[in-house]
């Protein structure tokens, strides 16, 4: 299966060129997409190329500036966000990261109706988040851990919390585990519908075990960066969830949500937060142990000027058989009653479907069935569901986008994509204007990613957003790989790879193969998905076999293959690289002298384990930012698939899961060991405690570090880490510089 | 020096409405800093809250007796007044008006009326 | 409602005494206490807010301690103008509840 622009004459092959690293390196061949800003049913804001802030409305076909370059560049705005009213603009300046999603800015407020910044009452800085109300001009924010609420922009900020602390107390905002493992954002408070309430989360973390790591800048001395971080087992963050009215937020003042009682008598999470209306909200909880959720909808109860959460409005979501969810557990989408959702969890057979819940979850109307999983579910409208599954022609890693009229009975189902670029798109998300009356598609591939702007009754094209034309002209001339998805049926297992082969690829040869794995619990790397990296420069100018396996423990493919893996880490993906590369021996075009491995953190850690299989297959490989241990990775994703660290838990397989435990097997493979020194997320530790184990068994290995780089390793180490990665494999594989 | 004066009837009759005013002297009425409350005292019993009123008119009752309290505000006179219907001897009690601070948090009635006594009697 | 709970109800003290006076909610209310005095025939006089914040004007001798659900009110070295009745109050959450008193007489 070739899933590739088509080339147009043979004889212009003379004329066309391999991918080289510098290409891959400078980005030459990045894709846009194009999101439109959401502002009503009809009317869409995009920053343009020259940096103007443009209002677009569909249905007059009439675009216009609301903010101009020169406004943008006088605060060097980086980005903007209208007010609901459309009578503000904040624009957000000296961005600095803090973790994946967290960072600081400096806000100004522009007032459009006067074309004026707004001078009084200003924003301190740097803010760590901020946002409007959906209804108005009403601005919450966080400073210095605390929340703010200004009524209007000019006006004096009221402090709704006074608790915050660096490091200690966390208002609005998530701690680090909280941002990384379970919310995915940087921001833990919500406005309700129309702004009469806003929802917020304290994190406290005074008890929590901190990480200390030296960040070596430039100074005489190295800094010492601390975050509080819970490695497996160890003493997790307190939470509590505050609701306060912001008309008159002073007088009651924040009122806690109360923790369902099943999930308060022992260690727990809250993973997410959904406003159902003004005046109800729904929370969701999990037990430490991850494999029960409870679902709770409480309610403004207006005498009290509190919040209650009746036990018949709890919903209990219960794995069996693995951890609750997928990744995470799935969020419900309420529907137009207010009371009843649709939410995606297992089916009977162990798929992940939709299921609509009007009073319990044991009497759940099974809305979407079959041996696929539906994905994600975009919008519900009075008369239609839009949500993203892998049904289509039963290929996991293809997104197809569905409406199912749920108006009607018995509801239809629709494909609104799978026929539209058939062979360019088969990876598709959604971006929907209010109430669905119009949608963007973005497709990623397998083709060159295309944007398109769609009718939401209808599904009409509208027209194109972006459709990459210079990417398209600039790959004109080069050779691309061949690209294939297929699938090995082993032990009734189902493996699908994905191979990338160099443009000349001719079976009857030998190449060189490169397992390129991550392999995560609920991960897949097996995507229709149009990419040019570094994988693609190496099939391309290097002439080497590059694969992508998802084995056991990956995601999309049911319940069985998901929870192989629980309370395993560490055995079955493994297992099933190894497996894939006997069989991709078998295909009779790999050369076995030369196959290589390399991953990146649970990708490393996976890779280092293959290599220290003793199975004798890897010649090499390589492990960017591995973990090398769960007792030393995060509490939240460790424990979910691991269980506890304790003698009456699962400390056993803690214990034999480590790559240090099997250093003495790296004695016959080439092994290059990569870490970022400043890695907060999975910590240099790790690598230093294979790099010990390996020298204690006198081991040679290879390594390279880079200083105060996190586990991204961006900006000039990018550069440096592909370079050597490629010398390493090229030396490794023999083949010429 | 901020002055709060309760004025009313000293006895009403069971099932009518008790009503008072409380008159703020020596401060403005219509400032966003403070509520301005209501408490009651039966005799040789403690205090309970009735409820509170902003300046622009948002009240908070007291759930138990919500249904037969109405408080409202007039910043012209610098006023606000307190309805209780329905009365039944339950009600005898000293009734005192007082500003409730509430900026920063928590509140609490820094100024109080000196009260007076309302009789539920036929 | 959160129901404020003081104990004792009455105590006995002379002058000079330390004297101490608790206040249980049976939720937490977090600091969110204050305490009032009441001398017969008057109207409460308020003087500590936010469980421990001495309003001004009020003699250094009272404090108050606690957060969560557990609250004192200490007299240091009871003078004979302290001789009333205390009432904890707490702001968290409507209504407004008092506690239901102690009195603080002369032995």
């Known amino acids: 299966i070739v899933l590739r622009p088509s080339r147009v004459h043979n004889s212009e092959e003379n004329t066309m060129r391999a991918l080289t690293l510098k290409d891959i390196l400078n980005g030459t061949f990045s894709y846009k997409t194009f999101f439109p800003n959401w502002i009503s049913g009809q009317e869409y804001l995009h920053q343009s190329a020259d940096n103007n802030i443009v209002l677009y409305n569909i249905e007059t076909g009439q675009s216009y500036t609301i903010l101009s370059n020169r406004t943008m560049k006088s605060v060097n705005a980086s980005n903007y966000g209208l007010s609901p009213d459309r009578q503000f603009v904040y624009l957000e300046s000296d961005y600095s990261k803090l973790w994946r999603y967290s960072y600081t800015a400096t806000y100004y407020i522009y007032d459009l109706s006067n074309g004026e910044f707004v001078r009084g009452n200003e924003l301190p800085r740097p803010i760590q988040y901020l946002c409007w109300s959906p209804v108005g001009s009403k601005l919450a924010y966080v400073y210095q851990n605390n929340i703010y609420l200004k009524q209007r922009p000019g006006d004096p900020p009221f402090q709704i919390t006074f608790n915050g602390r660096e490091n200690k107390i966390f208002n609005g905002i998530p701690d680090w585990v909280y941002e990384e493992e379970m919310l995915a954002t940087k921001y833990a408070l919500w406005w309700s519908p129309n702004g009469k309430f806003l929802a917020y989360a304290e994190f406290n973390d005074t008890d929590i075990p901190v990480i200390a790591y030296s960040y070596y800048g430039d100074e005489q001395y190295p800094r010492t960066i601390n975050i509080p971080y819970p490695k497996a087992g160890a003493k997790n963050p307190v939470v509590r969830i505050f609701i306060i009215d912001t008309t008159y937020p002073a007088y009651v003042g924040p009122q806690e949500v109360p923790v369902p009682a099943m999930i308060a008598s022992s260690d727990y999470y809250f993973s997410w937060l959904t406003w159902v209306t003004d005046e109800r909200v729904c929370l969701q909880w999990l037990k430490r142990v991850q494999n029960v959720s409870v679902l709770s909808i409480c309610d403004f109860r207006e005498d009290w000027q509190t919040w209650d959460c009746p036990k018949t409005q709890e919903h209990i979501e219960e794995s069996r058989t693995g951890w609750a969810g997928g990744f995470f557990v799935s969020t419900p989408v309420f529907s137009y009653d207010a009371i009843s959702y649709y939410k995606i969890f297992s089916d009977k057979d162990g798929y992940k479907h939709i299921h609509y819940i009007k009073d319990t979850v044991e009497n759940a109307i099974q809305i979407t069935s079959g041996k696929w999983e539906a994905i994600n579910i975009f919008r519900v409208t009075q008369d239609s569901l839009f949500y993203s599954s892998n049904e289509f022609e039963e290929y996991p890693g293809r997104r197809n986008i569905y409406r199912i009229s749920i108006g009607s009975y018995p509801p239809s189902k629709k494909c609104v994509t799978c026929h539209l670029r058939k062979e360019r798109c088969q990876y598709y998300t959604a971006s929907f204007s209010d109430y669905a009356k119009y949608y963007a598609l973005v497709c990623y591939g397998p083709g060159i990613p295309i944007s398109t702007l769609h009718d939401g009754r209808t599904d009409q094209e509208i027209k194109i957003l972006e459709e990459n034309k210079e990417l398209e002209n600039a790959l004109k001339n080069i050779q691309l790989p061949k690209e294939e998805i297929k699938k090995l049926e082993v032990d009734e297992i189902t493996l699908w790879y994905k191979m990338i082969l160099p443009p000349q690829f001719d079976r009857s040869k030998k190449y060189p193969l490169l397992i390129q794995v991550y392999g995560g619990p609920c991960s897949q790397s097996v995507r229709s998905v149009f990419a040019v990296n570094w994988i693609s420069y190496l099939a391309s100018k290097e002439g080497m076999v590059i694969a992508l396996v998802d084995g056991r423990g990956t995601a999309f493919q049911g319940d069985k293959l998901l929870y192989a893996v629980y309370r395993k880490l560490g055995v079955y993906e493994v297992e099933d690289q190894i497996t894939a590369v006997r069989k991709f021996i078998e295909m009779g075009f790999i050369d076995e002298k030369r196959i290589a491995i390399w991953g990146w953190s649970y990708g490393g850690y996976v890779s280092s384990l293959a290599l220290a299989s003793g199975t004798g297959l890897f010649k090499c490989g390589i492990a960017v930012a591995p973990v090398s241990s769960w007792e030393y990775y995060a509490s939240v994703y460790t424990e979910r698939f691991m269980g506890l660290p304790t003698k009456d838990d699962n400390l056993e397989h803690y214990k034999n899961s480590t790559v240090m435990a099997r250093a003495e097997y790296f004695r016959n493979v080439d092994y290059l060991l990569i870490h970022g020194t400043a890695d907060d997320n999975v910590h240099f530790q790790n690598s230093a405690q294979i790099a010990k184990a390996l020298v204690n068994a006198q081991v040679d290995f290879q390594a390279m570090w880079y200083s105060d780089q996190n586990h991204g390793l961006s900006g000039l180490s990018t550069n440096h880490l592909y370079t050597h990665m490629t010398h390493f494999l090229k030396q490794c594989f023999s083949l010429s510089d | 020096q901020l002055q709060l004066q309760e004025s009313g009837p000293g006895l009403v009759k069971p099932s009518e409405t008790l009503s008072l005013t409380c008159t703020v002297s020596g401060g403005s009425i219509s400032s966003s800093t403070y509520y301005w409350g209501w408490i009651r005292q039966p005799p040789g019993k403690g205090l309970e809250w009735i409820g509170s009123i902003f300046y622009s008119g948002n009240t908070y009752y007291n759930p138990s007796l919500k249904s037969r309290v109405t408080i409202s505000v007039d910043t012209s006179k610098n006023q606000f007044s307190l309805r209780l219907n329905s009365v039944t001897a339950a009600d005898t009690a000293v009734y005192y008006c007082?500003?409730?601070?509430?900026?920063?948090?928590?509140?609490?009635?820094?100024?109080w009326g000196q009260g007076t006594l309302v009789t539920v009697s036929s | 409602d959160i129901q404020m709970t003081q104990s004792p109800s009455s105590l006995s003290a002379s002058v000079g005494d330390r004297v101490t006076i608790t206040c249980r909610a049976s939720q937490s209310i977090s600091k969110y206490l204050n305490w009032y005095q009441q001398k017969p025939g008057k109207a409460p006089k308020f003087l500590i807010y936010?469980?421990?914040s001495l309003q001004s004007g009020v003699p250094s001798r009272f404090s108050g301690s606690g957060s969560g659900t557990d609250f004192t009110l200490t007299i240091s070295s009871l003078q004979p103008e302290d001789f009333a009745t205390y009432y904890c109050q707490q702001s968290n959450s409507i209504p407004r509840t008092f506690g239901q008193g102690t009195k603080v007489e002369i032995k």
């Open positions: 936010a469980a421990s």
């Open positions: 007082a500003r409730e601070i509430i900026e920063p948090r928590p509140g609490y009635f820094d100024y």
